[in-house]
């Protein structure tokens, strides 16, 4: 499958799409920055290889699905660049299962890097958390907002890892 | 390797207008804004403005405002501060300065070399 | 507008001298926080963020604390290249707003 190609147009589109959805100026949400610790050290220091990789930015990819398909996230955004948006992810997710059956065959594909794949789930959980203490509020999203592209962007050495054969 | 590197030097008489520059290299020019700092010869240091090169989206300091336009082309990773018409009190050092945005990473954490802008008749 | 305020505006200090400066915000600012070094005919260098965080490439001689309204930045040992102006800066809102600066001097 050659999922380095259609994985990065795809990640571009998406990045593309959150940065176009921002409905209010950044500037008046200084006071909101927050530290949700992505846990890039633990990625910057691992060599990935593939079907690691492609779990790992699947959970990533399959949590901020989640997170954009709420409600709340719902009231927050203009509705037609969220459904593309949402759209987009949704292809990513397909693109990455197809390469795993693919890959090593449906019946090998447990959780080989649990991990990592927890420490993403941690990292959603603390953007999940923020939003809701700061009541879903229009700059608290506007941060998360940022702070999911920096994370699409940071996964570089999962990207890498996408192109080693196992 | 970050780099920002700014304009050389001017020197110009009151009234005339400028545009100065700062072009970001080494990192995605549009994941940071670029702030503006001023310093009047010996004295410190005092804010200006910023931009969001994303979307050119601008803030600037009460004393700043409609004294001076931030600008920027994404194209060529450059942004801009323009003055119409200059008085010698603008004569001071100009730092660009990348900003993390609403990003939890650390404030102005490169800085440009300067431009020294100089007005006088 | 936030106001800082730095204490004191110069001092003289021998090299291996323990150095504080502080700085106090009109309101609180949290851990908003942050401080630079300036050289003469150089442009500013960013030495500790949120307050407390030391910047990569910085020595760990210096250190900042505080939270809130007033703010400290320590240089443990003095050495011949830490003679500067010091700033701090508010991060917390716009429009962003710096100290007056310290400048440390040679006794």
């Known amino acids: 499958c050659d999922l380095p190609q259609t994985h990065s147009l795809r990640n571009r589109r998406a990045l593309i799409l959150l940065a176009q959805m921002g409905r209010i100026s950044p500037f008046s949400c200084l006071k909101d920055r927050h530290e949700f610790r992505f846990p890039e050290e633990e990625f910057d220091g691992h060599q990935f290889q593939k079907t690691q990789a492609i779990s790992v930015l699947h959970e990533m990819i399959q949590q901020t699905f989640n997170l954009f398909s709420t409600e709340d996230s719902s009231a927050a955004w203009e509705q037609s660049l969220l459904e593309k948006f949402s759209t987009e992810l949704y292809q990513q997710l397909n693109d990455l299962e197809a390469c795993v059956i693919q890959e090593v065959g449906v019946e090998e594909t447990p959780l080989m890097n649990e991990d990592f794949i927890l420490a993403v789930r941690k990292y959603f959980q603390r953007i999940t958390l923020y939003l809701m203490e700061k009541k879903y509020s229009p700059c608290a999203w506007e941060v998360v907002r940022a702070e999911i592209m920096r994370s699409f962007s940071f996964s570089t050495n999962l990207k890498k890892g996408l192109r080693r054969k196992d | 390797e970050v780099q920002l590197v700014q304009s050389g030097a001017e020197v110009k008489k009151p009234g005339e207008s400028l545009k100065i520059s700062c072009k970001g290299s080494?990192?995605?020019?549009?994941?940071?804004?670029i702030g503006w700092v001023r310093q009047m010869p010996g004295k410190g240091l005092e804010w200006m403005g910023i931009?969001?090169?994303?979307?050119?989206?601008?803030a600037y300091s009460p004393s700043f405002q409609g004294q001076v336009t931030i600008s920027a082309d994404k194209s060529i990773s450059t942004a801009y501060l323009q003055w119409s018409s200059l008085k010698a009190s603008d004569t001071a050092m100009y730092y660009c300065a990348r900003h993390p945005g609403l990003n939890w990473a650390p404030d102005f954490d490169y800085w440009g070399q300067g431009t020294l802008v100089t007005v006088s008749s | 507008d936030i106001q800082m305020t730095q204490s004191p505006s110069s001092l003289s200090a021998s090299v291996g001298d323990r150095v504080t400066i502080t700085c106090r915000a009109s309101?609180?600012?949290?851990?908003?926080l942050n401080w630079y070094q300036q050289k003469p005919g150089k442009a500013p260098k960013l030495l500790i963020y949120f307050a407390s965080s030391l910047q990569s490439g910085v020595p760990s001689r210096f250190s900042g604390s505080g939270s809130g309204t007033d703010f400290t930045l320590t240089i443990s040992s003095l050495q011949p290249e830490d003679f500067a102006t010091y700033y701090c800066?508010?991060?917390?809102?716009?429009?962003?707003?710096f100290g007056q600066g310290t400048k440390v001097e040679i006794k």
């Open positions: 309101q609180s600012i949290g851990d908003f």
């Open positions: 931009i969001d090169p994303s979307d050119s989206d601008t």
């Open positions: 080494g990192y995605s020019f549009t994941s940071y804004w």
């Open positions: 800066q508010q991060a917390l809102d716009f429009p962003l707003t």
